[in-house]
């Protein structure tokens, strides 16, 4: 399936403080799950993968082709 | 407390250059996405940029794509706005933000007047 | 781009009342859809996000519902300090803001 990269963001992007636990944002990702599609202004964000919003940061996130790494799957796996 | 504080604003003639900054701290600068946002006097707010947290990405306004470059230097929790080409529909208050989408806090803002 | 048309653009209200102000894109954003409130010579403030989750330290009298293209943002009950200028923004196209809607006080 490919590699699952994350921003290294926390829940701290919707919360007042950035080790903050949410509450709010942890209601929203049980209610809605914890990715959503992308927003259309980060379709060329992954460059070897696919995109997935986090929907507790509201933030894009890449799951990563096989072979490729990085924030934006921009990387090739040299050990792969 | 998260801190973000605009410099580099200013009087600047039509066609002429400006940086802003926007100096960051009170969160761990590095994990988040930043933005640009400005609002012209007595008007609206209107997204400019953003980058996300390790600046390899970049998303631009048609309104100032190919004019504005957005960069960040995380080691000194920085953010930039370069302004070039500017016009007289740049005058703004211009604030940096925290995130790429949404925007939870925001600077106090620089006036940036381009006029001649 | 998207166009987030907000309305009333402008509206009286008297503390203690329900009110209510609408925004509509242009296109469905899903449930891409921010609230913000700002005041004179203020920075604006996240009220919600997602179209109805509250930020964080915002007070529960406001609410924000709706999805696709039609949203709204509830006060319940108007305080004195809620009396200000109201953004909704989206953000599945690029980033776009509404033209505002400013309370002022009856």
């Known amino acids: 399936d490919g590699n699952s990269t994350r921003s290294p963001e926390t829940n701290g992007l919707l919360c007042g403080d950035p080790e903050e636990n949410c509450a709010a944002t942890t209601t929203q990702s049980k209610r809605k799950g914890h990715f959503s599609r992308c927003p259309k202004q980060y379709k060329h964000y992954c460059i070897k993968g696919r995109c997935r919003f986090v929907v507790a940061e509201q933030t894009p996130s890449c799951v990563c082709d096989e072979g490729y790494i990085g924030a934006r799957c921009e990387r090739v796996d040299l050990f792969y | 407390q998260v801190q973000l504080l605009e410099s580099g604003g200013g009087l600047v003639q039509p066609g002429g250059s400006l940086r802003l900054s926007c100096a960051a701290s009170?969160?761990?600068?590095?994990?988040?996405?930043i933005s640009w946002v400005r609002q012209a006097p007595g008007k609206g707010l209107e997204w400019v940029s953003h980058i996300n947290y390790e600046g390899t990405w970049t998303l631009y306004a048609d309104s100032v794509k190919g004019r504005f470059t957005i960069s960040r230097d995380n080691s000194k929790n920085t953010l930039y706005l370069q302004m070039n080409s500017l016009r007289a529909e740049d005058t703004a208050v211009y604030y940096c933000?925290?995130?790429?989408?949404?925007?939870?806090?925001w600077g106090q803002g620089t006036l940036v007047t381009v006029s001649s | 781009d998207i166009q987030m048309t907000q309305s009333p653009s402008s509206l009286s209200a008297s503390v203690g009342d329900r009110v209510t102000i609408t925004c509509r894109a242009s296109q469905g954003i899903i449930s891409y859809l921010g609230w913000y409130q700002q005041k004179p010579g203020k920075a604006p403030k996240l009220l919600i996000y997602a179209a109805s989750s509250l930020q964080s330290g915002v007070p529960s009298r406001f609410s924000g519902s709706g999805s696709g293209t039609d949203f709204t943002l509830t006060i319940s009950s108007l305080q004195p300090e809620d009396f200000a200028t109201y953004y909704c923004q989206q953000y599945d196209a690029l980033n776009t803001f509404g033209q505002g809607t400013k309370v002022e006080i009856k």
């Open positions: 009170g969160f761990t600068f590095s994990r988040y996405w």
């Open positions: 933000a925290r995130g790429g989408s949404l925007f939870d806090y």
